[in-house]
């Protein structure tokens, strides 16, 4: 086993060079200190070492720092960022800006939102702000990510970027990432009326509470029967005939056809026949 | 049976403040939007400010806003409006009324507020 | 702000009288329509909503008719007790507003 072998007489490196190019992955294993590898990032980063010997390097740098590598490392990391997974990322303690900013370049075009989303989040959870260069970053990638966050990192995340989020972007979401994400959509569309306003938050609604709803419902939303299904059941059963009459508009008859089904079925059962037989739909509670 | 019963009403110098409190009972408060409606002497009903069921939500419409503020305590079942800088012609009768959806299905006897040096 | 327009301002009918009131929108409210009855010194209460249904312990003698902007409130054979104002309310849009009301008196 490599692990075992003790490293040869002179083969103990000072410096991070292109001799260890030539070097057997036991050598390696053996000779190379994960504090010399992390003082020279920027050497381990120019040498073409290949995809096995980086694996090693990475193995002597988790053993190194087995509570997760420190600040200053993970600036420098450059391209080795690559090999780093997001359960390694999640172990980081990320304050700066320009760290983050760093390796966002880096993972450009390399098929690495799983470990841009446990960076930024990282960084979040360190209290650190999203700026502009962050924000951009992250638009290349599909926002589901924001499901990925936790729940406090979500509170991090600036109102802006509500507006990047498209209709199954949340599918995946938990009940309690909606309810936050629905109230970031709600102050990020604050400024927007009418129409448009009830198209942006629509992918949010299911985040929406009782309380939510109600409010929704004073401003002619007239919402469709597939977003109405895709409501908390929760927030549905507590609204009146009148509320779920102003909420759906013109779509109130659509009810019939669902009636059988739940979200509608649970919000039936709840009301009285006779509040039911106000809508002149024959529906039964 | 649902009641709501208003409080706080009074003569009033013009630019002064003034608190009514609505005390409702016979229904679960926290379920329902609340709203003010007024009347002025031998004139029609006016819509003043409505309050969604946790507080969070308020609308008024232009003639007060700025001046009025309607606010809500759930554990005391109490509705409140808060009415500052207040003007000759907000001399009113001011109802508490229950909404529900786009309707004031139950209203309390009123509590006149007159403003007047 | 939507304008609810009400005719007539007041009428004199007798008891057993059909009584018809109108209550015409400035643009479409669909049938957010109400309407409510107040008598003197008292609070208003709810008669009818959503253009045609009725509040729960009103009588069948009062009826709501209408859509879009133009709606009506009737009353089949007038009771001594029918004597008050009459007022509609749209429940379309903010600000929600009410007609000038119809007073309603013994002829």
């Known amino acids: 086993d490599t692990e075992q072998k003790a490293c040869p007489p002179g083969k103990e490196p000072n410096v991070v060079d292109e001799n260890l190019i030539f070097y057997q992955n036991w050598e390696l294993e053996a000779c190379v200190d994960g504090t010399l590898l992390a003082g020279q990032m920027d050497l381990v980063n120019e040498i073409p070492f290949t995809y096995e010997q980086l694996s090693i390097f990475k193995h002597k740098l988790d053993k190194t720092y087995p509570q997760g590598y420190p600040e200053s490392l993970i600036k420098q990391l450059g391209h080795f960022f690559r090999y780093v997974s997001p359960e390694d990322i999640r172990q980081w303690n990320v304050t700066s800006p320009d760290t983050v900013n760093t390796l966002l370049k880096v993972s450009k075009g390399q098929k690495m939102d799983a470990q841009v989303i446990a960076l930024v989040a990282c960084y979040l959870r360190g209290g650190g702000k999203l700026d502009e260069d962050i924000v951009k970053a992250l638009d290349n990638i599909p926002l589901s990510y924001l499901c990925d966050f936790s729940p406090q990192d979500l509170h991090a995340i600036p109102s802006s970027v509500m507006w990047l989020v498209g209709l199954h972007d949340l599918d995946k979401c938990s009940q309690r990432h909606l309810g936050i994400l629905y109230q970031k959509a709600c102050s990020a569309f604050q400024n927007v009326s009418g129409l448009e306003y009830f198209e942006k938050i629509r992918t949010f609604l299911g985040g929406a509470s009782r309380e939510d709803l109600r409010a929704l419902s004073q401003h002619n939303v007239s919402m469709d029967i597939a977003t109405f299904k895709k409501l908390q059941v929760d927030a549905l059963v507590g609204l009146s005939v009148a509320e779920v009459q102003k909420l759906l508009g013109p779509h109130i008859g659509d009810l019939k056809t669902e009636e059988d089904k739940s979200p509608v079925r649970d919000w039936l059962f709840r009301q009285q026949q006779k509040d039911l037989d106000s809508l002149g739909l024959g529906l039964q509670g | 049976e649902v009641q709501l019963v208003e409080s706080g009403g009074g003569l009033v110098q013009p630019g002064g403040s003034l608190r009514l409190s609505c005390a409702a009972s016979?229904?679960?408060?926290?379920?329902?939007?609340m709203s003010w409606v007024r009347q002025a002497p031998g004139k029609g009903l006016e819509w003043v400010a409505t309050?969604?069921?946790?507080?969070?939500?308020?609308y008024y419409p232009d003639s007060v806003k700025g001046r009025f503020t309607i606010s809500r305590d759930n554990s005391k079942n109490t509705l409140y409006l808060q009415m500052n800088s207040l003007r000759a012609e907000d001399t009113a009768v001011y109802y508490c009324?229950?909404?529900?959806?786009?309707?004031?299905?139950?209203w309390g006897q009123g509590t006149l507020v007159t403003v007047s040096s | 702000d939507i304008q609810m327009t009400q005719s007539p301002s007041s009428l004199s009918a007798s008891v057993g009288d059909r009584v018809t009131i109108t209550c015409r929108a400035s643009?479409?409210?669909?049938?957010?329509l109400n309407w409510y009855q107040q008598k003197p010194g008292k609070a208003p209460k709810l008669l009818i909503y959503?253009?045609?249904r009725l509040h729960s312990g009103v009588p069948s003698r009062f009826s709501g008719s209408g859509s879009g902007t133009d709606f009506t409130l009737t009353i089949s054979s007038l009771q001594p007790e029918d004597f008050a104002t009459y007022y509609c309310?749209?429940?379309?849009?903010?600000?929600?507003?009410f007609g000038q009301g119809t007073k309603v008196e013994i002829k």
């Open positions: 009324a229950r909404f529900d959806g786009y309707i004031f299905d139950y």
């Open positions: 309050i969604s069921n946790g507080g969070t939500y308020t």
């Open positions: 309310q749209q429940g379309n849009t903010l600000p929600y507003t």
């Open positions: 643009q479409d409210i669909s049938n957010y």
């Open positions: 016979g229904f679960t408060f926290s379920d329902y939007f």
């Open positions: 959503y253009t045609s």
